[in-house]
Interface confidence: medium
């Protein structure tokens, strides 16, 4: 009783990104405790006066929760005992971006870690052959991006080639007036080649590949969040 010492525990977060309008996860883990009632989780956001979320004595304690997070947060209550303090954030908003602190108290001590959370919009592109065009044309479409991304075309056969002169990219604002639809058209494509449409902003990088041969068309898409690091 009244033992002296540093009493710090290890808390680990992972920088992540939230997709506007979808649910997001702010990841945080800590050294677990054997007793749930001795664990307190507090999520805080820099510049926000109230708490983002508080979990203590085995349940949510939301009396000090800030208005901007009201009804939008939850921890994985059944996983707290094993050291998971990750926060689920409903309906991610652009304004949710910022520095968060995952603050943990257990009977072993306390600790915290900061987490940089970026918000934006990102989606998988789809590349199709545009049969309506007069020449062989590819059309790359991605429904939701923000901030405005860059679009670059590449090909397997002509590696290192610059396709900016033979492509045209447009951005169309979506109905909620934040995200935009990305459409990029590549002209003068050749058969028996694989083309890649690469869309990138500071949050995510997505690639849509299409392989066109005389007998078939093969497609593949990939999305990578750029700021996810331990």
């Amino acid at each position: 009783f009244g033992i002296s010492g540093r009493h710090s525990i290890t808390v680990t977060t992972v920088a992540s990104a939230g997709n506007i309008g979808e649910d997001g996860i702010l990841s945080c883990t800590f050294e677990p405790d054997i007793k749930l009632s001795d664990i307190v989780i507090q999520w805080l956001k820099e510049g926000v006066l109230g708490l983002v979320h508080e979990f203590k004595e085995g349940k949510d304690e939301l009396s000090e929760q800030d208005e901007m997070f009201r009804g939008r947060t939850a921890v994985f209550a059944d996983q707290v005992i094993v050291g998971n303090a990750s926060l689920r954030l409903k309906n991610v908003q652009l304004t949710d971006a910022g520095t968060y602190k995952c603050y943990i108290i257990t009977s072993k001590g306390k600790g915290n870690a900061n987490l940089e959370y970026k918000t934006g919009a990102f989606s998988m592109p789809e590349v199709n052959v545009d049969y309506n065009a007069s020449s062989e044309t590819l059309r790359c479409e991605a429904p939701r991006w923000f901030p405005q991304p860059t679009v670059v075309w590449a090909s397997q056969v002509d590696q290192g080639a610059n396709f900016s002169e033979v492509s045209n990219t447009s951005f169309e604002l979506n109905s909620e007036n934040v995200t935009m639809k990305v459409v990029s058209v590549l002209y003068n494509v050749t058969i028996n080649n694989t083309y890649s449409c690469m869309i990138e902003n500071d949050i995510a990088k997505a690639t849509g590949d299409i392989k066109v041969t005389e007998s078939e068309i093969k497609r593949r898409s990939h999305l990578q969040l750029l700021n996810s690091k331990a």
Partner: antibody, heavy 117, light 107 residues
């Protein structure tokens, strides 16, 4: 609104002991760290130590051997036991809730301890 | 221990002046720093938390900046009620340490 009220201060002779109390009302006691901070007359603030509701305490190494912090959750109170007091321990002693957390900042009004013969 | 060096230790200023107080940490403390105002006979009152966030109810003329080892408290236009002593506090590691204080006096 959380309130912290210190008591137990007063005049004590060098070498003597004193126990300060801090009663917490109007808020949860568990899940926070409870701190003692002191301020000698005309001087700056010095952190003494902290304790949580389960009795786990951390001290300022310069004071650890003579000062002990304890807690009584049934009474929503925590305490500072001071032994082998010296003239330089004369100060206003404040209790405070969780200096560590960004969002919580509650202090008691302070209690004066005078060590003099 | 992390040493918090606060400067100046005192300053004289007039109402309406812009006042800047600096705290330097002996090692990096991220943004784990608060600024406190203390008036004679009273407990400290927190003005700024997390180095730059304004405490609820504190006038916007107070602002904080900095990260790592260098931190600043600025009062954009000094008011009569601002004459007090100001302290920084690091809560990055144990033991918690305060700066030595800056007494702001009327010129």
């Amino acid at each position: 609104e959380v309130q912290l009220v210190e008591s137990g201060g007063g005049l004590v002779q060098p070498g003597g002991s004193l126990r300060l109390s801090c009663a917490v009302s109007g808020g949860s006691f568990s899940g926070y760290y409870w701190n003692w901070v002191r301020q000698a007359p005309g001087k700056g603030l010095e952190w003494i130590g902290e304790i949580n509701h389960s009795g786990s305490a951390t001290y300022n190494p310069s004071l650890k051997s003579r000062f002990t912090i304890s807690v009584d959750t049934a009474k929503n109170s925590f305490y500072l036991q001071m032994n082998s007091l010296r003239a330089e321990d004369t100060a206003v002693y404040y209790c405070a809730r969780e200096l560590y957390n960004w969002n919580v900042d509650h202090w008691g009004q302070g209690t004066l301890v005078t060590v003099s013969s | 221990d992390i040493q918090m060096t606060q400067s100046p230790s005192s300053l004289s200023a007039s109402v309406g002046d812009r006042v800047t107080i600096t705290c330097r940490a002996s090692q990096g403390i991220r943004n784990d720093l608060g600024w406190y105002q203390q008036k004679p006979g009273k407990a400290p009152k927190r003005l700024i938390y997390a180095a730059s966030s304004l405490q609820s109810g504190v006038p916007s003329r107070f602002s904080g900046s900095g990260s790592g080892t260098e931190f600043t408290l600025t009062i954009s236009s000094l008011q009569p009620e601002d004459f007090a002593t100001y302290y920084c506090l690091q809560h990055n590691s144990y033991p918690r340490t305060f700066g030595g204080g800056t007494k702001v006096e009327i010129k």
